[in-house]
């Protein structure tokens, strides 16, 4: 019968998917950076603010040279899909203060999401081991005040910024071992 | 155009072995993480082993597991599976398959019977 | 038996529009992993038709669609041909196979 027919190339491959990740990423950082700044504005705040239900930052600039493909992608999802409930929480949450944000909180989730989906099909592609990306997640309760939502979405910005910062970086210096 | 050539099936005795192989073209082989899914006459399809792009994992599915491996070579575009202590229940047409799977070959037969 | 469930059969007349349902466990679509859908025309091999739940491959028409919710997954075909006549399969990431896992197909009949 001869060689059979082949398949059309689907609409991306794993290099072109860790480019649309890095994208993705820088996009979302910009976003972060300018929701942060507007939260500072309105609500100045007093010093750092940390939740204890957030992810320790993953990475720092000296371990940058050791990342490893799998390591990278699977830390930045399980921490990127523990930012994206945090920000599913603070919406649902927040007090009438933050109402005036929801907007840009909305936008910012819808981003995360996307973000997840790419580093998801991209792990599919490239066939590396995934971390159930809906693993329990530590219970949230209602913010003690309204002051209390307010703090909480200044430590999620905050750590959020710090995240996308690292991932930047990490997807980057990946691009060339793939 | 993407290729995915699959070779090496035909009949075999229970107890048996053969080594099926899959010459791929048309893509970057290697930065995808490759597949050997099967379908037993009239049946649906069933994934049977996966290897990541550079080779360091590689997962089976129980009904083959310590008796089928997979590998694969980069420098050559080519993805293999040796199967051994071939059962009649193996028999089926075996697929290679790219990425999600994302590209699929035609598929070779594989017969196992006395 | 299939570890994602989907209906063995499906029919429609030419121009109709038929949904096939996809559902999963706890290691697999409940926890979050993104579906794809391959279709498989008649002595042929499968075909990706959607992935990431509701991504089209170029060259895939319109008239495909995908959708997750929750804990299923569905593929719906508007403008029913006679061409679309195939057996179709849902697929899935699965944490507890560490590869993926397909629904047993669903035949599609164009009457």
């Known amino acids: 019968p001869g060689p059979p027919a082949g398949s059309p190339r689907v609409s991306s491959d794993p290099r072109a998917d860790l480019d649309s990740a890095v994208l993705l990423t820088r996009s979302l950082l910009a976003d972060t950076r300018q929701l942060a700044a507007q939260m500072r504005d309105k609500f100045p705040a007093d010093g750092d603010h940390n939740l204890d239900s957030l992810p320790t930052l993953a990475m720092s600039a000296g371990t940058l040279g050791s990342l490893q493909l799998p390591g990278v992608l699977t830390r930045l999802r399980v921490d990127l899909m523990s930012y994206f409930r945090h920000v599913q929480w603070l919406r649902r949450a927040a007090g009438p203060s933050l109402k005036t944000l929801e907007p840009e909180l909305g936008a910012l989730q819808a981003r995360l999401e996307r973000l997840l989906r790419r580093l998801q099909l991209l792990m599919s592609r490239l066939a590396l081991p995934q971390a159930a990306p809906d693993q329990p997640a530590v219970p949230l309760g209602p913010p003690a005040s309204a002051w209390g939502s307010i703090r909480a979405a200044h430590a999620i910005l905050g750590g959020l910024h710090l995240t996308l910062d690292w991932a930047v970086r990490g997807l980057l210096l990946l691009k060339t071992r793939l | 155009e993407v290729q995915l050539l699959e070779s090496g099936g035909g009949l075999v005795q229970p107890g048996g072995s053969l080594r099926l192989s899959c010459a791929a073209s048309?893509?970057?082989?290697?930065?995808?993480?490759m597949h050997w899914v099967r379908q037993a006459p009239g049946k649906g399809l069933e994934w049977v082993a996966v290897i990541s792009y550079d080779g360091s994992y590689k997962y089976y599915a129980d009904s083959v597991k310590g008796r089928f491996t997979i590998s694969r070579d980069n420098s050559k575009n080519t993805l293999y599976l040796q199967m051994n202590s071939l059962r009649a229940e193996d028999t089926a047409v075996y697929y290679c398959?790219?990425?999600?799977?994302?590209?699929w070959g035609q598929g070779t037969l594989v017969t196992v019977s006395s | 038996q299939s570890v994602l469930t989907q209906p063995p059969s499906a029919s429609g007349t030419p121009g109709q529009r038929v949904t096939i349902s996809c559902s999963g466990s706890s290691s697999n679509i409940w926890s979050g992993y993104d579906v794809h859908w391959y279709q498989q025309l008649p002595g042929t091999a499968p075909k990706l038709l959607i992935y990431s739940n509701e991504e089209r491959p170029s060259g895939v028409p319109d008239r495909f669609s995908g959708s997750k919710s929750g804990t299923s997954a569905s593929l719906a075909i508007s403008g029913l041909r006679s061409e679309d006549e195939a057996d179709y399969y849902c697929?899935?990431?699965?944490?507890?196979?560490?590869?993926?896992?397909f629904g047993g197909g669903t035949k599609l009949t164009v009457l």
């Open positions: 398959a790219a990425g999600v799977p994302d590209y």
């Open positions: 048309g893509f970057t082989f290697s930065s995808y993480g």
């Open positions: 697929a899935a990431w699965d944490s507890s196979l560490y590869g993926p896992v």
